[in-house]
């Protein structure tokens, strides 16, 4: 006869491991007992369990409540056992020693491999600002056994670097994603992808990029100079910019206070029916936590009864 077992049994942390040991004997042969022991190198055999044809299952105190026979129906030549709720410390070499009649004793060894699936974590880097050089966008760390694979999935252009730390029974892998921040990256997903044999599918953690920037400011509303004449209603100036975080707007008049009746509504400056008093230099001040920008325009309200043309001067300043 001969023993049938596996070279390696692989199980995920917390699952039950079946340790196979089947005696394929000739007819009339009987198995008296099967002794299971842990036999890691450099250490003596440690009892796991004893399956006896008459006495039944004996479990070592160290494994009490964790070792069982597979559910019925059971073949009397089957010496397999179930190790419940495998933990990392269970990883190692195991031996089954089968005593048969009349053929004598047989033994076989197997290795139990306990996969420890990673629990990845993603840590964003420092605040990203347009104009910075190569900057850490995020780091992703995953620890498991064996070492997990950590990669990045993104449309954003960048560079990655990885490092690994080996522990006694596991390995931690950290991957960093660096980029040169630009406003086009704002709102883009950066996904850490962790692969591991103990995972049914890759684990993914997504971080949305936030890049601080503030665009140049400009003022719209003076494109048609002829519209800015005395008596015109609904005249307005609109300040144009964009930024992250979204900017706030403030209007001032460079050559004095804002005329009465002029309404400030965020990025828009609304005028009452135009008079010559509304002529002047207006400044739009745009700011966010990252930066500030100014844009100024000169409004010259035209008196249609005068022949002189209206002068409009646009100046932009940062």
């Amino acid at each position: 006869g001969e023993l049938e077992t596996s070279d390696v049994v692989t199980v995920v942390l917390g699952q039950d491991a079946k340790l196979p040991c089947f005696y394929r004997g000739d007819s009339g042969e009987q198995v008296g007992q099967v002794a299971w022991a842990r036999v890691d190198a450099g250490e003596g055999a440690q009892e796991l369990a004893l399956l006896h044809s008459k006495y039944g299952l004996h479990v070592s105190p160290a494994y009490e409540g964790r070792v069982e026979q597979p559910p019925p129906p059971r073949n009397p030549l089957d010496g397999s056992v179930l190790l419940r709720n495998a933990v990392q410390a269970d990883e190692g070499e195991y031996e089954c020693r089968v005593s048969t009649f009349p053929a004598g004793s047989f033994q076989a060894r197997l290795r139990l491999r306990v996969l420890v699936p990673p629990l990845p974590s993603l840590n964003p880097g420092p605040a990203l600002e347009e104009g910075q050089g190569l900057t850490l966008a995020a780091s992703c760390t995953a620890e498991g056994s064996p070492a997990p694979s950590v990669t990045w999935d993104t449309e954003v252009k960048g560079t990655t670097s990885s490092r690994s730390f080996k522990h006694s029974r596991s390995a931690a892998v950290t991957s960093e994603f660096h980029l040169v921040p630009s406003r086009s990256m704002n709102g883009q997903p950066l996904t850490c992808v962790v692969s591991h044999p103990g995972l049914l599918q890759d684990q993914r953690i997504t971080h949305i990029l936030h890049v601080s920037f503030l665009a140049e400011a400009s003022v719209r509303g003076l494109e048609d100079q002829n519209l800015w004449h005395i008596g015109r209603e609904g005249a307005m100036l609109k300040c144009l910019s964009e930024g992250q975080p979204p900017p706030s707007y403030n209007w001032t008049r460079l050559d004095g206070p804002l005329p009465s009746g002029v309404r400030v509504d965020g990025d828009t400056l609304g005028f009452p029916p135009l008079t010559t008093e509304h002529s002047g230099i207006y400044v739009c001040h745009v700011s966010n936590e990252f930066s500030s920008r100014d844009s100024q325009v000169t409004v010259d309200v035209l008196d249609p009864q005068e022949d002189s043309g209206k002068q409009v001067d646009l100046v932009s300043a940062s």
Partner: antibody, heavy 123, light 107 residues
């Protein structure tokens, strides 16, 4: 025929010592685990101590730990129990018994017993 | 230690009666249970091992059953030589422990 014959019992004062012997014959002594079991007058059976077949691994009941020592001489097919610091409650018939080691520290039932030797601890 | 609780502690029966003695372990012991018969002034004699296996030379009127924590010794038809004290013993763990005994007396 398997035979186990105990000797060495007798009357001893509290605090005294005795050495019990168990001579085995009719089987391969060195292949079996051996144990001592006692029975106080009118009482039940109490396991006292055990020893593995070929190693020096020994086991003791809490009630005798540190006072009794079990040993064996496989070349003489003899089991011993050295009893020190004897107390009145150690008064009993002491039996030796054999059991087959299945594996690790797991034994069969004790299938053969000696006739017993009486130990009386009294002043 | 595993406690073995035997019942009854004594019983009176007549020749030919069917006698049942029970033994309960404080935790599971698979079938690592033996039954012994002891007569006054004599050494215990093994009757049943592995909970239900009859020791060689023991009459077939003796039988054992059970596994785990609950066990039974049955004498199907009590004979005059069966009047004795019966003990159960677990040898699943060290120390092996005995029940307190059941004395079977003549009614």
């Amino acid at each position: 025929e398997v035979q186990l014959v105990e000797s060495g019992g007798g009357l001893v004062q509290p605090g005294g010592s005795l050495r019990l012997s168990c001579a085995a014959s009719g089987f391969s002594f060195g292949s079996y685990g051996m144990s001592w079991v006692r029975q106080a007058p009118g009482k039940g059976l109490e396991w006292v101590s055990g020893i593995k077949p070929s190693t020096s691994t020994t086991y003791y009941a809490d009630s005798v730990k540190g006072r009794f020592t079990i040993s064996r001489d496989n070349s003489k097919n003899t089991l011993y129990l050295q009893m020190n610091s004897l107390r009145a409650e150690d008064t009993a018939v002491y039996y030796c018994a054999r059991a087959e080691l299945l594996a690790f520290d797991v034994y069969t039932a004790s299938d053969y017993w000696g006739q017993g030797t009486l130990v009386t601890v009294s002043s | 230690d595993i406690q073995m609780t035997q019942s009854p502690s004594s019983l009176s029966a007549s020749v030919g009666d069917r006698v049942t003695i029970t033994c309960r372990a404080s935790q599971g012991i698979s079938s690592y249970l033996a039954w012994y018969q002891q007569k006054p002034g004599k050494a215990p004699k093994l009757l049943i091992y592995a909970a239900s296996s009859l020791q060689s030379g023991v009459p077939s009127r003796f039988s054992g059953s059970g596994s785990g924590t609950d066990f039974t010794l049955t004498i199907s038809s009590l004979q005059p030589e069966d009047f004795a004290t019966y003990y159960c013993q677990q040898h699943y763990t060290t120390p092996p422990t005995f029940g307190q005994g059941t004395k079977v007396e003549i009614k």
